[in-house]
């Protein structure tokens, strides 16, 4: 109960990581994160 956690993301495909509450698809190279996804394994909003 006391240990830290490094949650992995069990999502289809690659490039998902925990951003905020959810596992989100990261932004492509050259883009930056505007907003994280709002559902499990969702797409971040990138600019």
């Amino acid at each position: 109960q006391g240990g830290t956690r490094s949650p992995r993301c069990d999502c289809a495909g690659d490039f998902h990581k925990k951003i905020g509450l959810f596992c989100c698809r990261g932004c492509p190279a050259g883009h930056y994160l505007k907003a994280p996804c709002t559902e499990p394994c969702g797409n971040s909003t990138c600019l």
């Epitope: 949650p7 289809a12 709002t38 559902e39």
Partner: antibody, heavy 122, light 111 residues
């Protein structure tokens, strides 16, 4: 022993403000996402705010967006809920809840405090 | 928002029998291979207690007489055999998307 203890509830007039606190112990607070959930006696539970661990993203339902602000102080192992522009419908028992840990985020809430009561009335 | 409808609202079950509680979602709560439904038990004057997460996973310390099943929009919590201490209100919750919502609750009484 994992423990979360809420405080700060009370009687406030409509339009007023209140700040709730939740003191956590028995686990590495900074590693867990946290939520506030409220309940009108004998009624449905309503999730009102969440904050992520590490990057501190915050989330709210439309019913409280712009009026409530969730925050955390990992150094003090404390979660907060700043409530403003309070309405009579915000009257409820407010629970602090830890999101379940594990290999990946699951968003179930595994430890809850006893709650702190908020009454909005003139 | 996803609406969770629980049935029945309340019922009574004899000691040792099976109790079945239904939770129906207004849209699918399944994605990425998981069904994002969780079950809680709440007794009067106490906070909710997590029983089952992700539809069928028993939380640590919860007796094996509790089980969960379902997929898509229809989910079930089973308690068998029912014991006196199981008298409580049971809630389902989804985490498929924001906002997280809870069912309206099912009150279980023991005969």
């Amino acid at each position: 022993e994992v423990k979360v203890v809420e405080s700060g509830g009370g009687l406030v007039k409509p339009g007023g403000s209140l700040k709730l606190s939740c003191a956590a112990s028995g686990f590495v607070f900074s590693s867990y996402d946290m939520s506030w959930v409220r309940q009108i006696p004998e009624k449905r539970l309503e999730w009102v705010a969440a904050i992520s661990s590490g990057d501190y993203y915050t989330y709210y339902p439309d019913s409280v967006k712009g009026r409530f602000t969730i925050s955390r102080d990992d150094a003090r192992n404390t979660l907060y809920l700043q409530m403003s522009s309070l309405r009579s419908e915000d009257t409820a028992l407010y629970y602090c809840a830890r999101h379940r840990g594990g290999n990946y985020p699951q968003y179930a809430m595994d430890y809850w405090g006893q709650g702190t009561s908020v009454t909005v009335s003139s | 928002d996803i609406l969770l409808t629980q049935s029945p609202a309340s019922f009574a079950v004899s000691l040792g029998q099976r109790a079945t509680i239904s939770c129906r979602a207004s849209k699918s709560v399944s994605t990425s291979g998981y069904n994002y439904i969780h079950w809680y038990q709440q007794k009067p004057g106490q906070p909710p207690k997590l029983l089952i997460y992700l539809t069928s996973n028993l939380e640590s310390g919860v007796p094996a007489r509790f089980s969960g099943s379902g997929s898509g929009t229809d989910f079930t919590l089973n308690i068998h055999p029912v014991e006196e201490e199981d008298a409580a209100t049971y809630y389902c919750q989804h985490s498929r998307e924001l906002p997280f919502t809870f069912g309206s609750g099912t009150k279980l009484e023991i005969k």
